[in-house]
Protein backbone atom coordinates (compact mmCIF):
# COMPACT_ATOMS: atom_id res chain seq x y z
CA UNK A 1 0.00 0.00 0.00
CA UNK A 2 1.53 3.29 -1.01
CA UNK A 3 0.64 6.95 -1.16
CA UNK A 4 2.35 8.58 -4.15
CA UNK A 5 5.88 7.20 -3.72
CA UNK A 6 5.57 6.21 -0.04
CA UNK A 7 4.73 2.86 1.49
CA UNK A 8 2.10 3.32 4.20
CA UNK A 9 1.97 -0.27 5.44
CA UNK A 10 3.53 -3.67 4.76
CA UNK A 11 2.22 -6.61 2.78
CA UNK A 12 0.91 -9.52 4.85
CA UNK A 13 2.01 -12.00 2.16
CA UNK A 14 5.28 -13.78 1.50
CA UNK A 15 6.65 -13.48 -2.03
CA UNK A 16 8.90 -15.94 -3.83
CA UNK A 17 12.22 -14.65 -5.23
CA UNK A 18 11.15 -15.92 -8.68
CA UNK A 19 8.41 -13.28 -8.64
CA UNK A 20 10.78 -10.37 -7.97
CA UNK A 21 12.94 -8.50 -10.47
CA UNK A 22 14.38 -5.86 -8.15
CA UNK A 23 13.86 -3.70 -5.12
CA UNK A 24 14.27 -0.18 -3.80
CA UNK A 25 14.59 0.93 -0.21
CA UNK A 26 12.40 3.53 1.40
CA UNK A 27 13.83 5.35 4.39
CA UNK A 28 11.65 7.00 7.00
CA UNK A 29 12.03 10.76 6.70
CA UNK A 30 9.91 13.92 6.45
CA UNK A 31 8.29 12.54 3.26
CA UNK A 32 7.70 8.89 4.22
CA UNK A 33 6.65 7.57 7.62
CA UNK A 34 8.17 4.08 7.59
CA UNK A 35 11.26 2.17 6.50
CA UNK A 36 10.35 -0.29 3.76
CA UNK A 37 11.73 -2.54 1.06
CA UNK A 38 9.76 -2.04 -2.13
CA UNK A 39 9.85 -5.20 -4.24
CA UNK A 40 9.25 -4.85 -7.97
CA UNK A 41 7.50 -7.91 -9.37
CA UNK A 42 7.38 -9.51 -12.80
CA UNK A 43 3.78 -8.30 -13.08
CA UNK A 44 4.89 -4.70 -12.70
CA UNK A 45 3.54 -4.39 -9.18
CA UNK A 46 5.34 -2.64 -6.33
CA UNK A 47 4.99 -4.46 -3.01
CA UNK A 48 5.87 -2.83 0.31
CA UNK A 49 7.64 -5.20 2.71
CA UNK A 50 8.98 -4.96 6.24
CA UNK A 51 12.80 -4.79 6.12
CA UNK A 52 13.00 -6.40 9.57
CA UNK A 53 11.33 -9.63 8.49
CA UNK A 54 13.59 -12.56 7.73
CA UNK A 55 11.96 -13.49 4.41
CA UNK A 56 12.47 -9.91 3.19
CA UNK A 57 16.13 -9.89 4.27
CA UNK A 58 16.71 -13.19 2.46
CA UNK A 59 15.37 -11.88 -0.84
CA UNK A 60 17.27 -8.61 -0.51
CA UNK A 61 20.46 -10.58 0.18
CA UNK A 62 19.83 -12.86 -2.82
CA UNK A 63 19.10 -9.95 -5.16
CA UNK A 64 22.10 -7.97 -3.88
CA UNK A 65 24.37 -10.95 -4.61
CA UNK A 66 23.00 -11.10 -8.16
CA UNK A 67 23.65 -7.39 -8.68
CA UNK A 68 27.20 -7.68 -7.31
CA UNK A 69 27.96 -10.53 -9.74
CA UNK A 70 27.01 -8.40 -12.76
Amino acid sequence: ASNFDCCLRYTDRILHPKFIVGFTQQLANETCDINAVVFHTKKGLSVCANPKQTWVKLIVRRLSKKINKM
Epitope: R13, I14, L15, H16, K18, F19, K42, K52, Q53, T54, W55, L58
Partner: antibody, heavy 120, light 107 residues
Framework: QVQLVQSGAEVKKPGASVKVSCKAS????????MHWVRQAPGQGLEWMGV????????TYAQKFQGRVTMTVDTSTSTVYMELSSLRSEDTAVYYC?????????????WGQGTLVTVSS | DIQMTQSPSSLSASVGDRVTITCGAS??????LNWYQRKPGKAPKLLIY???NLADGVPSRFSGSGSGRDYTLTISSLQPEDFATYYC?????????FGQGTKLEIK
Protein backbone atom coordinates in the same frame (compact mmCIF):
# COMPACT_ATOMS: atom_id res chain seq x y z
CA GLN B 1 18.12 -36.44 11.59
CA VAL B 2 15.27 -33.97 11.18
CA GLN B 3 12.19 -34.84 13.23
CA LEU B 4 8.89 -33.07 13.81
CA VAL B 5 6.89 -34.64 16.62
CA GLN B 6 3.30 -33.53 17.11
CA SER B 7 1.00 -33.77 20.11
CA GLY B 8 -1.64 -36.47 20.39
CA ALA B 9 -5.19 -36.74 19.08
CA GLU B 10 -7.85 -34.42 20.48
CA VAL B 11 -11.64 -34.58 20.74
CA LYS B 12 -13.35 -31.21 21.12
CA LYS B 13 -16.88 -29.85 21.32
CA PRO B 14 -18.16 -27.26 18.81
CA GLY B 15 -17.19 -23.74 19.91
CA ALA B 16 -14.13 -24.91 21.82
CA SER B 17 -10.46 -24.33 20.98
CA VAL B 18 -7.63 -26.75 20.30
CA LYS B 19 -3.89 -26.20 20.60
CA VAL B 20 -1.59 -28.56 18.70
CA SER B 21 2.17 -28.62 19.30
CA CYS B 22 5.03 -29.54 16.99
CA LYS B 23 8.46 -30.14 18.50
CA ALA B 24 11.40 -29.91 16.09
CA SER B 25 14.81 -31.53 16.40
CA UNK B 26 17.84 -32.37 14.25
CA UNK B 27 18.29 -28.93 12.67
CA UNK B 28 18.71 -25.24 13.53
CA UNK B 29 15.15 -24.41 14.51
CA UNK B 30 15.21 -20.68 13.70
CA UNK B 31 16.58 -21.18 10.17
CA UNK B 32 13.38 -22.67 8.73
CA UNK B 33 9.73 -21.72 8.64
CA MET B 34 6.99 -23.93 10.02
CA HIS B 35 3.78 -24.38 8.06
CA TRP B 36 0.48 -25.88 9.18
CA VAL B 37 -1.54 -27.91 6.69
CA ARG B 38 -4.71 -29.88 7.33
CA GLN B 39 -6.61 -32.66 5.62
CA ALA B 40 -10.28 -33.24 6.39
CA PRO B 41 -11.77 -36.71 5.76
CA GLY B 42 -12.13 -37.30 2.02
CA GLN B 43 -10.69 -33.87 1.22
CA GLY B 44 -7.37 -32.59 -0.14
CA LEU B 45 -4.52 -30.77 1.57
CA GLU B 46 -5.29 -27.26 2.81
CA TRP B 47 -2.60 -24.72 3.74
CA MET B 48 -3.47 -22.84 6.93
CA GLY B 49 -0.53 -20.56 7.50
CA VAL B 50 3.14 -20.24 8.36
CA UNK B 51 5.33 -18.92 11.17
CA UNK B 52 8.96 -17.84 11.01
CA UNK B 53 10.56 -18.96 14.31
CA UNK B 54 13.37 -16.41 13.94
CA UNK B 55 11.06 -13.40 14.35
CA UNK B 56 7.59 -14.93 15.04
CA UNK B 57 6.26 -13.44 11.80
CA UNK B 58 3.02 -15.16 10.78
CA THR B 59 0.77 -15.11 7.78
CA TYR B 60 -2.50 -17.04 7.61
CA ALA B 61 -4.88 -18.18 4.89
CA GLN B 62 -7.84 -15.80 4.74
CA LYS B 63 -10.21 -18.66 5.59
CA PHE B 64 -8.63 -19.05 9.04
CA GLN B 65 -7.90 -15.38 9.77
CA GLY B 66 -9.22 -14.47 13.22
CA ARG B 67 -9.57 -18.12 14.28
CA VAL B 68 -6.00 -19.38 14.06
CA THR B 69 -2.95 -18.36 16.08
CA MET B 70 0.54 -19.74 15.51
CA THR B 71 3.17 -19.21 18.17
CA VAL B 72 6.71 -20.37 18.83
CA ASP B 73 8.82 -21.27 21.87
CA THR B 74 12.45 -21.12 20.74
CA SER B 75 13.70 -22.43 24.09
CA THR B 76 12.07 -25.81 23.38
CA SER B 77 12.08 -25.63 19.54
CA THR B 78 8.31 -25.99 19.55
CA VAL B 79 5.65 -24.39 17.39
CA TYR B 80 1.99 -24.23 18.39
CA MET B 81 -1.16 -23.88 16.32
CA GLU B 82 -4.35 -22.88 18.11
CA LEU B 83 -7.69 -22.98 16.32
CA SER B 84 -10.71 -21.45 18.05
CA SER B 85 -14.50 -21.50 17.58
CA LEU B 86 -14.28 -25.08 16.35
CA ARG B 87 -17.01 -26.51 14.14
CA SER B 88 -17.60 -30.00 12.77
CA GLU B 89 -15.91 -29.05 9.45
CA ASP B 90 -12.64 -28.56 11.38
CA THR B 91 -12.44 -32.32 11.96
CA ALA B 92 -9.17 -33.16 10.20
CA VAL B 93 -5.62 -34.34 10.51
CA TYR B 94 -3.39 -31.33 11.20
CA TYR B 95 0.25 -31.39 10.07
CA CYS B 96 3.19 -29.18 10.81
CA UNK B 97 5.75 -29.07 8.00
CA UNK B 98 9.18 -27.45 7.79
CA UNK B 99 9.42 -24.74 5.13
CA UNK B 100 12.79 -24.70 3.41
CA UNK B 101 13.56 -21.65 1.27
CA UNK B 102 16.72 -23.46 0.13
CA UNK B 103 14.56 -25.95 -1.77
CA UNK B 104 12.24 -23.50 -3.45
CA UNK B 105 10.12 -22.76 -0.38
CA UNK B 106 9.02 -26.40 -0.25
CA UNK B 107 7.83 -28.31 2.79
CA UNK B 108 10.59 -30.88 3.06
CA UNK B 109 9.83 -32.56 6.41
CA TRP B 110 6.43 -33.22 7.96
CA GLY B 111 5.13 -34.15 11.38
CA GLN B 112 3.19 -37.39 11.85
CA GLY B 113 -0.13 -35.52 12.02
CA THR B 114 -2.61 -34.83 14.81
CA LEU B 115 -6.22 -35.92 14.44
CA VAL B 116 -8.64 -33.33 15.78
CA THR B 117 -12.25 -34.49 16.03
CA VAL B 118 -14.98 -31.92 16.62
CA SER B 119 -18.17 -33.54 17.83
CA SER B 120 -21.00 -32.71 20.20
CA ASP C 1 -5.56 -16.09 -4.40
CA ILE C 2 -3.96 -18.36 -6.98
CA GLN C 3 -6.11 -21.41 -7.85
CA MET C 4 -4.48 -24.74 -8.70
CA THR C 5 -6.36 -27.29 -10.83
CA GLN C 6 -5.13 -30.87 -11.23
CA SER C 7 -6.17 -33.41 -13.80
CA PRO C 8 -7.22 -36.10 -13.80
CA SER C 9 -8.72 -36.31 -10.31
CA SER C 10 -8.23 -40.08 -10.40
CA LEU C 11 -6.29 -42.43 -12.61
CA SER C 12 -6.03 -46.22 -12.96
CA ALA C 13 -2.74 -47.62 -14.18
CA SER C 14 -0.62 -50.77 -14.07
CA VAL C 15 2.87 -51.45 -12.75
CA GLY C 16 5.37 -50.44 -15.45
CA ASP C 17 3.09 -47.81 -17.02
CA ARG C 18 4.18 -44.26 -17.75
CA VAL C 19 1.87 -41.82 -15.98
CA THR C 20 1.42 -38.07 -16.37
CA ILE C 21 -0.44 -35.76 -13.97
CA THR C 22 -1.04 -32.14 -14.89
CA CYS C 23 -1.47 -29.05 -12.75
CA GLY C 24 -2.72 -25.70 -13.97
CA ALA C 25 -2.43 -22.40 -12.13
CA SER C 26 -4.94 -19.57 -12.49
CA UNK C 27 -2.02 -17.27 -13.35
CA UNK C 28 1.70 -17.45 -14.15
CA UNK C 29 3.57 -18.83 -11.13
CA UNK C 30 7.04 -18.66 -12.71
CA UNK C 31 8.02 -22.22 -11.78
CA UNK C 32 7.29 -21.74 -8.07
CA LEU C 33 5.58 -25.11 -7.84
CA ASN C 34 6.12 -28.21 -5.72
CA TRP C 35 4.74 -31.77 -5.92
CA TYR C 36 3.90 -34.02 -2.96
CA GLN C 37 2.92 -37.67 -2.57
CA ARG C 38 0.52 -38.79 0.14
CA LYS C 39 -0.28 -42.35 1.16
CA PRO C 40 -3.22 -43.22 3.46
CA GLY C 41 -2.34 -42.79 7.13
CA LYS C 42 1.02 -41.21 6.32
CA ALA C 43 2.29 -37.64 6.16
CA PRO C 44 2.82 -36.10 2.72
CA LYS C 45 6.27 -36.44 1.16
CA LEU C 46 8.04 -33.85 -1.00
CA LEU C 47 8.80 -35.19 -4.49
CA ILE C 48 9.64 -32.22 -6.72
CA TYR C 49 10.50 -28.62 -5.87
CA UNK C 50 10.86 -25.62 -8.15
CA UNK C 51 8.79 -27.44 -10.82
CA UNK C 52 11.70 -29.59 -12.04
CA ASN C 53 14.05 -30.48 -9.14
CA LEU C 54 13.99 -33.93 -7.57
CA ALA C 55 13.89 -33.88 -3.77
CA ASP C 56 16.49 -35.87 -1.79
CA GLY C 57 15.88 -39.60 -1.78
CA VAL C 58 13.18 -39.54 -4.46
CA PRO C 59 13.65 -42.15 -7.24
CA SER C 60 14.66 -40.86 -10.67
CA ARG C 61 11.52 -42.33 -12.27
CA PHE C 62 9.76 -39.19 -10.96
CA SER C 63 10.23 -35.99 -12.95
CA GLY C 64 8.64 -32.57 -13.15
CA SER C 65 8.33 -30.12 -16.00
CA GLY C 66 6.46 -27.01 -17.00
CA SER C 67 6.49 -23.24 -16.78
CA GLY C 68 4.09 -20.32 -16.70
CA ARG C 69 0.67 -21.68 -15.78
CA ASP C 70 1.07 -25.35 -16.80
CA TYR C 71 3.02 -28.08 -14.99
CA THR C 72 3.41 -31.84 -15.22
CA LEU C 73 4.49 -34.66 -12.93
CA THR C 74 5.62 -37.79 -14.76
CA ILE C 75 6.32 -41.27 -13.39
CA SER C 76 8.27 -43.08 -16.09
CA SER C 77 7.62 -46.65 -14.91
CA LEU C 78 5.08 -47.16 -12.15
CA GLN C 79 6.16 -49.22 -9.15
CA PRO C 80 3.75 -50.80 -6.60
CA GLU C 81 4.76 -48.24 -3.96
CA ASP C 82 3.76 -45.34 -6.24
CA PHE C 83 0.03 -45.90 -5.84
CA ALA C 84 -0.94 -42.85 -3.77
CA THR C 85 -2.47 -39.37 -4.07
CA TYR C 86 -0.38 -36.61 -5.64
CA TYR C 87 -0.71 -32.87 -4.98
CA CYS C 88 0.79 -29.81 -6.63
CA UNK C 89 1.30 -26.63 -4.65
CA UNK C 90 1.81 -22.98 -5.55
CA UNK C 91 4.54 -21.22 -3.54
CA UNK C 92 4.79 -18.01 -5.56
CA UNK C 93 2.83 -16.02 -3.01
CA UNK C 94 0.89 -16.85 0.14
CA UNK C 95 -1.61 -18.42 0.54
CA UNK C 96 0.28 -21.49 -0.69
CA UNK C 97 -2.65 -23.20 -2.38
CA PHE C 98 -2.71 -26.93 -3.25
CA GLY C 99 -4.35 -28.64 -6.17
CA GLN C 100 -7.29 -30.90 -5.30
CA GLY C 101 -5.17 -34.04 -5.70
CA THR C 102 -4.87 -36.92 -8.17
CA LYS C 103 -5.52 -40.40 -6.83
CA LEU C 104 -3.44 -43.02 -8.60
CA GLU C 105 -5.00 -46.48 -8.33
CA ILE C 106 -4.02 -49.97 -9.48
CA LYS C 107 -5.81 -51.10 -12.65
Amino acid sequence: QVQLVQSGAEVKKPGASVKVSCKASGYTFTNYWMHWVRQAPGQGLEWMGVIDPSDSYTTYAQKFQGRVTMTVDTSTSTVYMELSSLRSEDTAVYYCARGNYGVDYAMDYWGQGTLVTVSS
Amino acid sequence: DIQMTQSPSSLSASVGDRVTITCGASENIYGALNWYQRKPGKAPKLLIYGATNLADGVPSRFSGSGSGRDYTLTISSLQPEDFATYYCQNVLITPYTFGQGTKLEIK
